[in-house]
């Protein structure tokens, strides 16, 4: 009465699975099973993941940890978070490159490359959606430039050039004669 | 009815090896984890190790750990114990046995024996 | 490890008595309410057989005479009359936990 329950025993639920003769406790995260219990609704005998392996969840049968992954150089890739005894590497793209993935039906464990982002500044265009998961989207030109075919042109600093309709929309200059 | 035929003991040197075998029948011997037993001579008995049904996961008192490993070979329905860097103190008359569970206590009690067999560690 | 004794390591009796064996572990060998504790007859030159399981059950094929008790620590083996060919010696045994452990064995003679 007020204190916490043990699980009951049971080779059915969660706690407890057969694993050799009795039903053992499992071993934690981060633990891989070195021997199993040796009375009935025993604790196995669990040792901590050795240093670049992991085991994300508890665990009944594991007798080694998987070993973390090492983020792929070739693609560009980063490590953003470690691995660790719990949880394996987390491999992304540093700042200012994104995820293009290689397959078509992309999941968080497909695999992928990263891609420099658009430099809108550079293109002379106005960032409309940072880029992150996918490439920056740019939107229109800059003050100072107008549309022209995939580009975006400088306004004339002066009125002699030539300037269309688009640029005279843009610029505030008439086409001079 | 079950049986449990033994084989493989005989006169070893000390720091050799030598495999039993036990050959089970009657019974399904898959289904049962399986131990074996040792008995030196005028003295009593000791368990030596077991091996579990399914997974196959073995067990063995400090005395024999790392120097003996148990096996089975459920498609030829037998045991084995390979004993490694024996000492004198191993020479015993080797029995095998099946476990039989009791009931959902997890509970095991030795309810089959094979007639044993002597293994003698001596230079 | 749990520790089995048993007593007395050897007695003699006469056909018809009653023998009592007492073997008494270590520690508690209960579990969910069952003593993992059998008793074994070995016959000379031959391999031990099991007579009774968990404390009090007489296992299949074995005759009445025997019987089992005790719970916890404390065990009791009986032979209600003794008969010529009960002449062996008896070991206790716990399964509560690995390693298994016998007693050290009685040996009974007749008188």
């Known amino acids: 009465q007020g204190g916490t329950r043990s699980p009951r025993c049971d080779c059915a639920g969660d706690f407890h699975k057969k694993i050799g003769l009795f039903c053992c406790r499992g071993c934690p995260a981060g633990h891989y099973l070195k021997a199993p219990c040796t009375e009935p609704c025993g604790n196995s005998t669990c040792l901590v993941c050795p240093q670049d392996t992991f085991l994300a969840w508890e665990n009944h049968h594991n007798s080694e940890c998987a070993r973390c992954q090492a983020c792929d150089e070739q693609a560009s890739q980063v490590a953003l978070e470690n691995c660790s005894a719990v949880a394996d590497t987390r491999c992304g793209c540093k700042p200012g490159w994104f995820v293009e993935c290689q397959v078509s039906q992309c999941v968080s464990s497909s695999p992928f490359y990263c891609q420099p982002c658009l430099d809108c500044g550079a293109l002379h265009r106005h960032t409309r959606l940072l880029c992150s998961r996918r490439d920056t989207d740019c939107g229109t030109c800059l003050p100072g430039f107008y549309e022209h075919g995939d580009g975006c042109v400088s306004c004339p600093t002066s009125t002699l050039g030539s300037c269309p309709e688009r640029c005279a929309a843009v610029c505030g200059w008439r086409q001079m004669f | 009815q079950v049986q449990l035929q033994q084989s493989g003991g005989g006169l070893v040197q000390p720091g050799g090896s030598l495999r039993l075998s036990c050959a089970a029948s009657g019974f399904t011997f898959s289904s049962y984890a399986m131990s074996w037993v040792r008995q030196a001579p005028g003295k009593g008995l000791e368990w030596v190790a077991t091996i579990s049904d399914g997974d196959s996961y073995s067990y063995f008192p400090d005395s024999v750990k790392d120097r003996f490993t148990i096996s089975r070979d459920n498609a030829r329905n037998s045991l084995y114990l390979q004993m490694n860097s024996l000492r004198a103190e191993d020479t015993a008359v080797y029995y095998c046995?099946?476990?039989?569970?009791?009931?959902?206590?997890?509970?095991?009690?030795?309810?089959?024996w094979g007639r044993g067999t002597l293994v003698t560690v001596s230079s | 490890d749990i520790q089995m004794t048993q007593s007395p390591s050897s007695l003699s009796a006469s056909v018809g008595d009653r023998v009592t064996i007492t073997c008494r572990a270590s520690?508690?060998?209960?579990?969910?309410?069952?003593?993992?504790m059998q008793w074994y007859q070995q016959k000379p030159g031959k391999a031990p057989k099991l007579l009774i399981y968990a404390a009090s059950n007489v296992e299949s094929g074995v005759p009445s005479r025997f019987s089992g008790s005790g719970s916890g620590t404390d065990f009791t083996f009986t032979i209600s009359s003794l008969q010529p060919e009960d002449i062996a010696t008896y070991y206790c045994?716990?399964?509560?936990?690995?390693?298994?452990?016998f007693g050290q064995g009685t040996k009974l003679e007749i008188k």
């Open positions: 046995a099946r476990d039989r569970i009791y009931g959902s206590v997890q509970y095991y009690a030795m309810d089959y």
């Open positions: 045994q716990q399964s509560r936990k690995l390693p298994y452990t």
């Open positions: 520690e508690s060998v209960e579990f969910s309410g069952t003593s993992l």
